[in-house]
């Protein structure tokens, strides 16, 4: 289920300090967790609608087994959820840009 109507979707955003850790989007809210040097890191951000490709299974919403768990959702602040850290450790992916945080 996608975002409602034409109303902007409000999401938690870990990098949006000046906007009170909130971003606004026409797409989805995303939260991702990974394990780096034994530390859990959550990244929360907005994904614009144009970047939700391919339809049905957008790249930005896919988890990477043993590397990163990711959850996309479509209601205000739904990405405040905490995810379980994957069982593996973060290795350098072949295509880092695909999994990098979205600003």
């Amino acid at each position: 289920s996608g975002p409602r109507g034409v109303q902007a979707l409000l999401c938690a955003c870990t990098s949006c300090l000046q906007a009170n850790y909130t971003c606004e989007t026409d797409g989805a809210c995303m939260v991702s967790i990974f394990n780096l040097d034994g530390m859990e890191h959550h990244v929360r951000t907005c994904i614009p609608k144009v970047e939700l490709v391919p339809a049905g299974k957008p790249f930005y919403c896919l988890s990477s087994e043993d590397l990163r768990n990711t959850h996309c959702c479509y209601t205000d602040y739904c990405n405040r959820i905490d995810l379980r850290v994957p069982s593996g450790h973060l290795k350098e992916p072949e295509h880092p840009s695909m999994w990098g945080p979205v600003e």
Partner: antibody, heavy 119, light 108 residues
């Protein structure tokens, strides 16, 4: 401490619309940080999540009930409501309202209200 | 059928330790929360997130996760712990909230 209380008719005729209201006391729906949810429990069975609303009006529904469910909020009355259309006997259940922490745990719950669908 | 699977019934001797489990693919990614429901009453949250306990819940209740299984452990079960216990989380596609079928705990 936040408390929730369900209210509405205990008997609804088949094909009609079930309407329930949850009144929140001890806290404001508008304070943010929570979803306001409806959950039901068929007699002698497990729990089924129906859907939730954020004070902004942002809603999310169980896909299995989508199309029949509408959840709305009235921040001025500190209430949120459930409407379930085209009911059948299979919708007979105890209906609970609950506050949902974003992260999907429910606390607290209302005491529940039994709604029977019968002619 | 539920996407979260629980044993229908479990029993424990008074004062002993019991573990109630909840299985599902989604639990590799999402935390489960746990609810206690006594006969004729509304459910009460007992464990949420990464083994967090709401205020007022005794410390004999604890939670853990491994692989696709979440567990609720009661260490030193009391007579008042006799109840139905439900887990909940997201479904495997992350589309909606689901509950397990429930486990009836009997304290002998």
């Amino acid at each position: 401490q936040v408390q929730l209380q369900e209210s509405g008719p205990g008997l609804v005729k088949p094909s009609q619309t079930l309407s329930l209201t949850c009144t929140v006391s001890g806290g404001s729906i508008s304070s943010g940080g929570y979803y306001w949810s409806w959950i039901r429990q068929h007699p002698g069975k497990g729990l089924e999540w129906i859907g939730y609303i954020y004070y902004s009006g942002s809603t999310y529904y169980n896909p299995s009930l989508k199309g029949r469910v509408t959840i709305s909020v009235d921040t001025s009355k500190n209430q949120f409501s459930l409407k379930l259309s085209s009911v059948t006997a299979a919708d007979t259940a105890v209906y609970y309202c609950a506050r949902e922490e974003v992260g999907d745990w429910f606390d607290p719950w209302g005491q529940g209200t039994l709604v029977t669908v019968s002619s | 059928s539920s996407e979260l699977t629980q044993d229908p019934a479990v029993s424990v001797a008074l004062g002993q330790t019991v573990r109630i489990t909840c299985q599902g693919d989604s639990l590799r990614k999402y935390y489960a929360s746990w609810y206690q429901q006594k006969a004729g009453q509304a459910p009460v949250l007992v464990i949420y997130g990464k083994n967090k306990r709401p205020s007022g819940i005794p410390d004999r209740f604890s939670g853990s996760s491994s692989g696709n299984t979440a567990s609720l452990t009661i260490t030193g079960a009391q007579a008042e712990d006799e109840a139905d216990y439900y887990c909940n989380s997201w479904d495997s596609s992350g589309n909606h909230v689901v509950f397990g079928g429930g486990t009836k705990l009997t304290v002998l």
